[in-house]
C-alpha cells in the first residue's frame, strides 16, 4: 500500500513492497489521525533509503503543516513527537535510479501518546524561588531562577522549553554567599588585594596616591557573620585632597615690591619679585611655596641694590690704594 | 546620631505573649544585623537571637528556639521580637543591640515583667 | 555553646591606680581565616545599656578614652584600665562572637 488514512491508536507504517525493494517513481502519503486531545509519537525502527529518495513528516494533517523531519538516505533507529493529533508521511522515491541501488525501505511504529506539549514542571529550589515567563511551560517559555539573598544561583539561572520538550538547562541550585562583594575602588588610590574573590578572610588595602590623605580604615578584611552574608569590617575608606599649610608671606625687599601681595600664600604658589628704577635684583625674582610638613620657600627672599653700586666700589678700591700717608712707617709700607 | 529606640515596659501573665519593638534610626538599616539580648540578676547577659534585615535570615540561641520570634519591617526601619509562653523566669530586661560581631549600639532597654 | 569565664568577679580600687581584669573562653577565638579574635569587652554603668569599649580584642571603640586597653589572644583576654577615674564605675563583661554570640558574668568595678 502506497497511501491512506490510519485511524488507529497505534500501527505500523511500512515502505512500498516492504521487506522487498520499493520501486522508483514513487510519491506515497499516509495519513495518522488519533484521538483530538492525544499526539503521536513515531519510532523510526529501520531507515534505508537511497540518497535521492525522501522522507519527510509533517506536523499535521496536510502537507502545508510544519515539517517534524526530513530524511534521506541511512540512518539508524529514531524518534519523533508531533504537537497534535495527525502527521502525515511523504516519501518520493527518485525516478532515475536504477532498481539495483535501491535499499529496503522503511518500518515506522506509531503510537498515540497523551498530549503534552509542554516540558515537565520545574520543581522550587532551597533558599530561592523561580519566575516563569508565562503560566503554561509550552515551548519556547523561559523560566528564570532567583536566590534569596545571602545566597547566590550555581549553574544557569535561566531555563527554556526546548523543541524536543526538555529543558535547555539542569536544574540550578543556591548556595551559602561565602565571600564579600567587591568594596570597589576608592578614588585617587590604588588596592592590594589579597584574593581575587574575596573569600572570607580576605582583605583589601587601599592606599591614597601623593599628596592625599586617607580618611577611613585603610584595610578592610572579610568577616563572616551570624545571621547575614559575608561583610567587610569597615565601609571603604575616602582619599582627600592633603589640606597643606600655606607659606606665610615675605616682605617686599627694600626699594623693591613683590608680587602678590598676600600674607598666607598656598603650597604650590609663586611669588615675584621686582625692583624700583636704578636698583638690580640679587636673588631670585621668582621663588615657590614647597608643599610640605610644614610649607616652605623654595629660596630666600631676593634684594634690591642701587644700579650704579657695583661701578662706586669697584672705583672706590682704588682709591683705597691712594690714601694719604698717615705716618712715615705707612708710607714706608706702600 | 545612631539610636535604637525600645517600646515600653510590658507586665504580662504567665502563659502570654509579647512583643517587643526596636526602631532604629541614625544608620541604614539594613547594612547592619539587628540582635536581642536580655539581663537578668540570675543569668547575666543572655543573647537570644539576631536577624539580618537585608535577607530575614535568622538565627537563635537553641535555649530559646520556638519560644521567640524576630522580624523586621524595611519601611518603618523597625525590628520586632515576639516572645511566647512566658514564664516568671523570663522576667528581664531586653535590649535590641546592633552588630555583626560586636554590639557597637544598644537599645534603650524595655523591662518585662510576668506575674499573675 | 563557648562559656566566658571572667575574674574577679569584683574588685574595689582607688582613683588613679591600674585595674586589670581576665576573660577566659572554652575554646579558642582566634579565626585563621580573618586572623581576628572574635572577642569584645562591654561597660554598663548603673542604671545604664551596655557600651562597647573594645572589639577584635584589642581594638579601642571610637570615643574610649586610651586609659582602656584590650589584649590577649585565642582563649585568654585581658582588659587593662591604666588610671582608674570616678566614672569608671562599671560592671565589665566580655563577650564572643566566634560561634553565635555568649557573654562573661561580668567584673563588678568599685571605687575606694
Known amino acids: 500500500v502506497c497511501s491512506g488514512e490510519i485511524t488507529d491508536s497505534a500501527g505500523v507504517v511500512l515502505s512500498p513492497n516492504w521487506p522487498e525493494p520499493y520501486g522508483r517513481g514513487q510519491d506515497c502519503i499516509w495519513g495518522v489521525h488519533v484521538e483530538e486531545d492525544k499526539r503521536i509519537m513515531l519510532d523510526i525502527r529501520v531507515l534505508r533509503i537511497g540518497p535521492g529518495d525522501v522522507l519527510t513528516f509533517y506536523d499535521g494533517d496536510d502537507l502545508t503543516a510544519r515539517v517534524l523531519g526530513q530524511y534521506s538516505g541511512p540512518r539508524s533507529h529514531f524518534k519523533l513527537f508531533t504537537s497534535m493529533a495527525d502527521v502525515t508521511i511523504q516519501f518520493q522515491s527518485d525516478p532515475g535510479t536504477s532498481v539495483l541501488g535501491y535499499q529496503q525501505g522503511f518500518v515506522i511504529h506509531f503510537f498515540e501518546v497523551p498530549r503534552n506539549d509542554t516540558c515537565p514542571e520545574l520543581p522550587e529550589i532551597p533558599n530561592g524561588w523561580k519566575s516563569p515567563s508565562q503560566p503554561e511551560l509550552v515551548h519556547g517559555t523561559v523560566v528564570t531562577y532567583q536566590c534569596y539573598p545571602g545566597y547566590q544561583v550555581v549553574g544557569s539561572s535561566v531555563l527554556m522549553c526546548q523543541w524536543d520538550l526538555t529543558w535547555s538547562e539542569d536544574l540550578p541550585s543556591c548556595q551559602r554567599v561565602t565571600s564579600c562583594h567587591d568594596p570597589g575602588d576608592v578614588e585617587h588610590s590604588r588596592r592590594l588585594i589579597s584574593s581575587p574573590k574575596f573569600p572570607v578572610g580576605a582583605t583589601v588595602q587601599y592606599i591614597c596616591d601623593q599628596g592625599f590623605v586617607l580618611m577611613g580604615s585603610s584595610i578592610l578584611t572579610c568577616h563572616d557573620r551570624q545571621a547575614g552574608s559575608p561583610k567587610w569590617s569597615d565601609r571603604a575608606p575616602k582619599c582627600l585632597l592633603e589640606q597643606l599649610k600655606p607659606c606665610h608671606g615675605l616682605s617686599a625687599p627694600e626699594n623693591g615690591a613683590r608680587s602678590p601681595e598676600k600674607q598666607l600664600h598656598p603650597a604650590g604658589a609663586t611669588i615675584h619679585f621686582s625692583c624700583a628704577p636704578g636698583y638690580v635684583l640679587k636673588g631670585q625674582a621668582s621663588i615657590k611655596c614647597v608643599p610640605g610638613h610644614p610649607s616652605h620657600w623654595s629660596d630666600p627672599p631676593p634684594i634690591c641694590r642701587a644700579a650704579s653700586l657695583d661701578g662706586f666700589y669697584n672705583s672706590r678700591s682704588l682709591d683705597v690704594a691712594k690714601a694719604p700717608a698717615a705716618s712715615s712707617t705707612l708710607d714706608a709700607a706702600h | 546620631q545612631v539610636q535604637l529606640q525600645q517600646s515600653g515596659a510590658e507586665l504580662v501573665r504567665p502563659g502570654a505573649s509579647v512583643t517587643l519593638s526596636c526602631k532604629a534610626s541614625?544608620?541604614?538599616?539594613?547594612?547592619?544585623?539587628m540582635h536581642w539580648v536580655r539581663q537578668t540578676p540570675v543569668h547575666g547577659l543572655e543573647w537570644i537571637g539576631g536577624?539580618?534585615?537585608?535577607?530575614?535570615?535568622?538565627v537563635y540561641n537553641q535555649k530559646f528556639k520556638g519560644k521567640v520570634t524576630l522580624t523586621e519591617d524595611k519601611s518603618s526601619s523597625t525590628a520586632y521580637m515576639e516572645f511566647r509562653s512566658l514564664t516568671s523566669e523570663d522576667s528581664a530586661v531586653y535590649y535590641c543591640?546592633?552588630?555583626?560581631?560586636?554590639?557597637?549600639?544598644w537599645g534603650t532597654g524595655t523591662t518585662v515583667t510576668v506575674s499573675s | 555553646d563557648i562559656v566566658m569565664s571572667q575574674s574577679p568577679s569584683s574588685q574595689a580600687v582607688s582613683v588613679g591606680e591600674k585595674v586589670t581584669m581576665t576573660c577566659k573562653s572554652s575554646?579558642?577565638?582566634?579565626?585563621?581565616?580573618?586572623?581576628?579574635?572574635?572577642l569584645a569587652w562591654y561597660q554598663q554603668k548603673p542604671g545604664q545599656s551596655p557600651k562597647l569599649l573594645i572589639y577584635?580584642?584589642?581594638t579601642r571603640e571610637s570615643g574610649v578614652p586610651d586609659r582602656f586597653t584590650g589584649s590577649g589572644s585565642g582563649a585568654d583576654f585581658t582588659l587593662t584600665i591604666s588610671s582608674v577615674q570616678a566614672e569608671d564605675l562599671a560592671v565589665y563583661y566580655c563577650?564572643?562572637?566566634?560561634?553565635?554570640?555568649?557573654f562573661g558574668s561580668g567584673t563588678k568595678l568599685e571605687i575606694k
Open positions: 543591640t546592633r552588630g555583626d560581631w560586636y554590639f557597637d549600639v
Open positions: 541614625g544608620y541604614t538599616f539594613t547594612d547592619y544585623e
Open positions: 536577624i539580618d534585615p537585608e535577607s530575614d535570615n535568622t
Open positions: 575554646q579558642s577565638l582566634l579565626n585563621s581565616r580573618t586572623r581576628e579574635n572574635y
Open positions: 577584635w580584642a584589642s
Open positions: 563577650g564572643q562572637s566566634y560561634n553565635l554570640f555568649t
